[in-house]
C-alpha cells in the first residue's frame, strides 16, 4: 500500500494500489535550499543535481563531528518527498540543491539571500520552464529575506516555504511571513496539526495551507536504499512543492496567483481540528489540507477567490488594519472583524494604484482585522462607489450604476463610536440585488466590477434569535466574492469568508437580549463567470 501522505494528497479517482498521477512534474525544475544531500541514493539518483552553491555557518561546539549521513539527512529526505521515484509526490520533477544549512541544520539570512540570488542569476543565464523554489527553513522575521523572496516571486518563480515548527504565529518568522511565498503548515494522518515534542506546526494568517508533515517516509542518507520517517513543516512544504510542480507541468503558463488559488481551491476543507490552535488564531488559520487536483486540466473555467486577513490593527483608537491582494488578483470585497465588537467598519481604498481593504478600530476596542476577498478575474475593471452617511431614516444606499457592472461586495464604515446600539434593523428592499444598504450614519462602499461574462447574485440567511454565528454559502458553480452582515444589529463582531461560506459572528448570546437586536442576517454575494466557462470548453 502507498504511504499515508501520498494517499492523502491523491484525489479518489487516482487511488489504486499505487500512486501514479497523470503527470509527474517533468516540465518543472525544483530548487531546494537546505542541507547537503546524498545524491546517489537510489530514490533520487539522476533526479537531483547538486549545484556547487554552498554558504553555511560553522557548526557549533568543539566536540561536533561531521558525519556525512547526518549532514545530508534533512535535504535527502526532502528531495525524496518532492521527487523520489518511490515515495515522492512529483516523480517526474528534476531538482537542483543548494547548501544553505550546515550539518546541524543551521543557516544564515545572508547565506539564504545569496542562494536566492544564485537562482535568479541561473534563471537569467539559462531560462528553463517553470521554477519552484523550496525553502524548508524558518528563522526570525527578516524584512530583507522577505524582500528577496518578493523579488524572486515577481520574476515568475514559485516559492514554497515551511511555516516553522515553533507552535507559534508564522507571521513572526521568515520567509514564512513573506506574502508572495506559499507558506505551509503540517498535519498528520488524522488531519490534525502536527505536534513536535512540546512545540509543533506554526499557524495563523501567514499560513496559506497545510499538508502532510508527520511520519513522512522518505529517502534516508544512511544508505543508498535506506528510508526513514521524518516530521515537520519542511516535509509539509515539500509536498506542496511537489504538487505545485505537477500543476505547473500540466499548465506551465500558470502565474503564482493562479497557482496559489488552485492549491487553495483543491485542498480538503474544514478537516483540521481547530481546537489545537490558540483561540485567537483559529479564525485566522486556514482549515485547508493540500491535495492534487482531480484532473490536471479543466480548472480554468472557475472563478477562484481566497480570503486574506490583515495583521491585527492594535488597540489604539484610530488604529487601522490593511489587507492586500496579490498583484494579479482583484479585490472584490472587504469586511472587518473585531473580537470585542468595537469597530468602525471597513472601506476599500486605492493605494499605489491598487485597491486595498482597510478596517477601523473604535474607541475602547481591542483592535480590528481587515479581511480582503481576493479573486482571479481576467480583464476585470473594478471600482468602488461610495455613498456618504444619509439623512433619511431608511439608511444609506449605494448601487452599481455603470452599464455592465455587477456588485461583488459591500462595505460600510462609520465615524461614530457606537453605531446602531439603539436603532431598529434596516431591511434592504427586495428586488434590488445590485445595491448595498447601511446605517444612515455610515458610509457605504460598493465594489462594482465589469468582466466578460461575470454575473453575481445576493444570497441572505437571517436568524431572528441571537446566534453566535450565522452562515450563508454559495451553491455549486458559484464563488463567494462578498460577505457582510445586514445592518441594524449592534452585536455583530464582523463578517468574513471561509472558502465558499460567508460567516457573520456575533457577541456571546448570553450577553445579548433576545429582542429584535438579536436578529442577524448574513449576506453573501455569489458570482460566476460564463466567459471563463466558455473559454475552457473551447480549449478541451
Amino acid at each position: 500500500s502507498i504511504p499515508w501522505n501520498l494517499e492523502r494528497i491523491t484525489p479518489p479517482r487516482y487511488r489504486a494500489d499505487e500512486y501514479q498521477p497523470p503527470d509527474g512534474g517533468s516540465l518543472v525544475e525544483v530548487y531546494l535550499l537546505d542541507t547537503s544531500i546524498q545524491s546517489d541514493h537510489r530514490e533520487i539518483e539522476g533526479r537531483v543535481m547538486v549545484t556547487d552553491f554552498e554558504n553555511v555557518p560553522e557548526e557549533d561546539g568543539t566536540r561536533f563531528h561531521r558525519q556525512a549521513s547526518k549532514c545530508d539527512s534533512h535535504g535527502t529526505h526532502l528531495a525524496g518527498v518532492v521527487s523520489g521515484r518511490d515515495a515522492g509526490v512529483a516523480k517526474g520533477a528534476s531538482m537542483r540543491s543548494l547548501r544553505v544549512l550546515n550539518c546541524q541544520g543551521k543557516g544564515t539570512v545572508s547565506g539564504t539571500l545569496i542562494g536566492l540570488e544564485f537562482i535568479r542569476k541561473s534563471q537569467l543565464v539559462q531560462p528553463v520552464g517553470p521554477l519552484v523554489v523550496l525553502l524548508p527553513l524558518a528563522g526570525g522575521y527578516s524584512r530583507v529575506l522577505n524582500a528577496a523572496c518578493q523579488r524572486l516571486a515577481r520574476a515568475g518563480v514559485v516559492l514554497v516555504t515551511a511555516a516553522g515548527n515553533f507552535r507559534d504565529d508564522a507571521c513572526l518568522y521568515s520567509p514564512a511571513s513573506a506574502p508572495e511565498v506559499i507558506t505551509v503548515g503540517a498535519t498528520n494522518a488524522q488531519d490534525q496539526p502536527v505536534t513536535l515534542g512540546t512545540l509543533g506546526t506554526n499557524f495563523g494568517r501567514c499560513v496559506d495551507l497545510f499538508a502532510p508533515g508527520e511520519d513522512i517516509i522518505g529517502a534516508s542518507s544512511d544508505c543508498s536504499t535506506c528510508f526513514v520517517s521524518q516530521s515537520g513543516t519542511s516535509q509539509a512544504a515539500a509536498h506542496v512543492a511537489g504538487i505545485a510542480a505537477m500543476m505547473l507541468s500540466a499548465e506551465p503558463e500558470l502565474t503564482l496567483a493562479e497557482l496559489r488559488q488552485r492549491l487553495i481551491h483543491f485542498s480538503a476543507k474544514d478537516v483540521i481540528n481547530e481546537a489545537w490552535f490558540p483561540e485567537d488564531q483559529r479564525v485566522l488559520t486556514p482549515n485547508l489540507v493540500a491535495a492534487l487536483p482531480p484532473s490536471t486540466h479543466g480548472a480554468g473555467w472557475q472563478l477562484f477567490c481566497r480570503t486574506v486577513w490583515s495583521a491585527h490593527s492594535g488597540p489604539t483608537r484610530m488604529a487601522t488594519a490593511v489587507a492586500r491582494c496579490a498583484p494579479d488578483e482583484e479585490l472584490l470585497s472587504c469586511s472587518s472583524f473585531s473580537r470585542s465588537g468595537k469597530r468602525r467598519g471597513e472601506r476599500m481604498e486605492a493605494q499605489g494604484g491598487k485597491l486595498v481593504c482597510r478596517a477601523h478600530n473604535a474607541f475602547g476596542g481591542e483592535g480590528v482585522y481587515a479581511i480582503a476577498r481576493c479573486c482571479l478575474l481576467p480583464q476585470a475593471n473594478c471600482s468602488v462607489h461610495t455613498a456618504p452617511p444619509a439623512e433619511a431614516s431608511m439608511g444609506t444606499r449605494v448601487h452599481c450604476h455603470q452599464q455592465g457592472h455587477v456588485l461583488t461586495g459591500c462595505s460600510s464604515h462609520w465615524e461614530v463610536e457606537d453605531l446602531g446600539t439603539h436603532k431598529p434593523p434596516v431591511l434592504r428592499p427586495r428586488g434590488q440585488p445590485n445595491q448595498c444598504v447601511g446605517h444612515r450614519e455610515a458610509s457605504i462602499h460598493a465594489s462594482c466590477c465589469h468582466a466578460p461574462g461575470l454575473e453575481c447574485k445576493v444570497k441572505e440567511h437571517g436568524i431572528p434569535a441571537p446566534q453566535e454565528q450565522v452562515t450563508v454559502a454559495c451553491e455549486e458553480g458559484w464563488t463567494l466574492t462578498g460577505c457582510s452582515a445586514l445592518p441594524g444589529t449592534s452585536h455583530v463582531l464582523g463578517a468574513y469568508a471561509v472558502d465558499n461560506t460567508c460567516v457573520v459572528r456575533s457577541r456571546d448570546v448570553s450577553t445579548t437580549g433576545s429582542t429584535s437586536e438579536g436578529a442577524v442576517t448574513a449576506v453573501a454575494i455569489c458570482c460566476r463567470s460564463r466567459h471563463l466557462a466558455q473559454a475552457s470548453q473551447e480549449l478541451q
Epitope: 501514479q20 539518483e45 544508505c223 536504499t225 535506506c226
Partner: antibody, heavy 119, light 113 residues
Framework: QVQLVQSGAEVKKPGESLKISCKGS????????ISWVRQMPGKGLEWMGL????????HYNPNFQGQVTISADKSISTAYLQWSSLKASDTAMYYC????????????WGQGTLVTVSS | DIVMTQSPDSLAVSLGERATINCRSS????????????LAWYQQKPGQPPKLLIY???TRESGVPDRFSGSGSGTDFTLTISSLQAEDVAVYYC?????????FGQGTKVEIK
C-alpha cells in the same frame, strides 16, 4: 501469482550480440526495481545492476559498467539485459530479481537464463 | 564496496542436528535511522534460483520453516538451521542490500554428514 519469467537458454558465438528478457506479472511492474544477478558455473552470486521501470533509472555494478546494458519496456512489463559483443567469459546463468523501496531485498526471482558463449 | 565473508565454505551436519553459518560484513549494515540491519539470507538448491529465507537479518520470509532463524547485528550475522532436514541441502548466501554495489557472501554449502 507474482512471478518473473525469463527467456530461454541461449548459445552464442564470441562477438555476437544478445538480449535476454524478464517479464513480470501479478504485481505493479513499475513500482519495483529489477536487478540482474550473474552466476558463473560453480560460482557464487554477483549483482550486475538494476533498473526502475517507472522511469528507466539504472544503476550498474562498476565491474559490469560498459559491459552490459539494462533496459525495460514498462508497457509490456519486461526488463532486458543485453550484450553488444559477447565473450566466452560471459558464459553463466543470469537471474532477474525484484525488490521494492520498502523491501529492498530480492523476494521474487526469475527461473534463470543460461547463456553459453563458445566458438 | 562492502565485502561479505561467509564461514565456513562448506558444512556437513547430521540430520536433525543444528547447522550454523556465519557472515561478516566489512562495514556495519545497521542504520540508526530505522534501527534495521540491511542483511538477507538466501537458499539455492541445485538447478534452481535462489530463494529468500531471512531479511532485516532476523525476519523470516513467509512460508519459510521456523527451523531457520537469523541473528546478529552491525557486522556479524548468523543463519541457524535448528534441526537439519534432507531438503535443506543447498548453498546459502548472505547479502547486504544497503549500499551499491549490492554484494553477496561467497556461499556456504550445507551437506548431510
Amino acid at each position: 501469482q507474482v512471478q518473473l519469467v525469463q527467456s530461454g537458454a541461449e548459445v552464442k558465438k564470441p562477438g555476437e550480440s544478445l538480449k535476454i528478457s524478464c517479464k513480470g506479472s501479478g504485481y505493479s511492474f513499475t513500482d519495483y526495481y529489477i536487478s540482474w544477478v550473474r552466476q558463473m558455473p560453480g560460482k557464487g552470486l554477483e549483482w550486475m545492476g538494476l533498473i526502475y521501470p517507472g522511469d528507466s533509472y539504472t544503476h550498474y555494478n562498476p565491474n559490469f559498467q560498459g559491459q552490459v546494458t539494462i533496459s525495460a519496456d514498462k508497457s509490456i512489463s519486461t526488463a532486458y539485459l543485453q550484450w553488444s559483443s559477447l565473450k566466452a567469459s560471459d558464459t553463466a546463468m543470469y537471474y532477474c530479481a525484484r525488490d521494492h523501496w520498502s523491501k529492498p531485498y530480492f523476494d521474487v526471482w526469475g527461473q534463470g537464463t543460461l547463456v553459453t558463449v563458445s566458438s | 564496496d562492502i565485502v561479505m565473508t561467509q564461514s565456513p565454505d562448506s558444512l556437513a551436519v547430521s540430520l536433525g542436528e543444528r547447522a550454523t553459518i556465519n557472515c561478516r560484513s566489512s562495514q556495519s549494515v545497521l542504520y540508526s535511522s530505522n534501527n534495521k540491519n540491511y542483511l538477507a539470507w538466501y537458499q539455492q538448491k541445485p538447478g534452481q534460483p535462489p530463494k529468500l529465507l531471512i531479511y532485516w537479518a532476523s525476519t523470516r520470509e513467509s512460508g519459510v520453516p521456523d527451523r531457520f532463524s537469523g541473528s546478529g547485528s552491525g557486522t556479524d550475522f548468523t543463519l541457524t538451521i535448528s534441526s537439519l532436514q534432507a531438503e535443506d541441502v543447498a548453498v546459502y548466501y548472505c547479502q547486504q542490500y544497503s549500499s551499491f554495489p549490492i554484494t553477496f557472501g561467497q556461499g556456504t554449502k550445507v551437506e548431510i554428514k
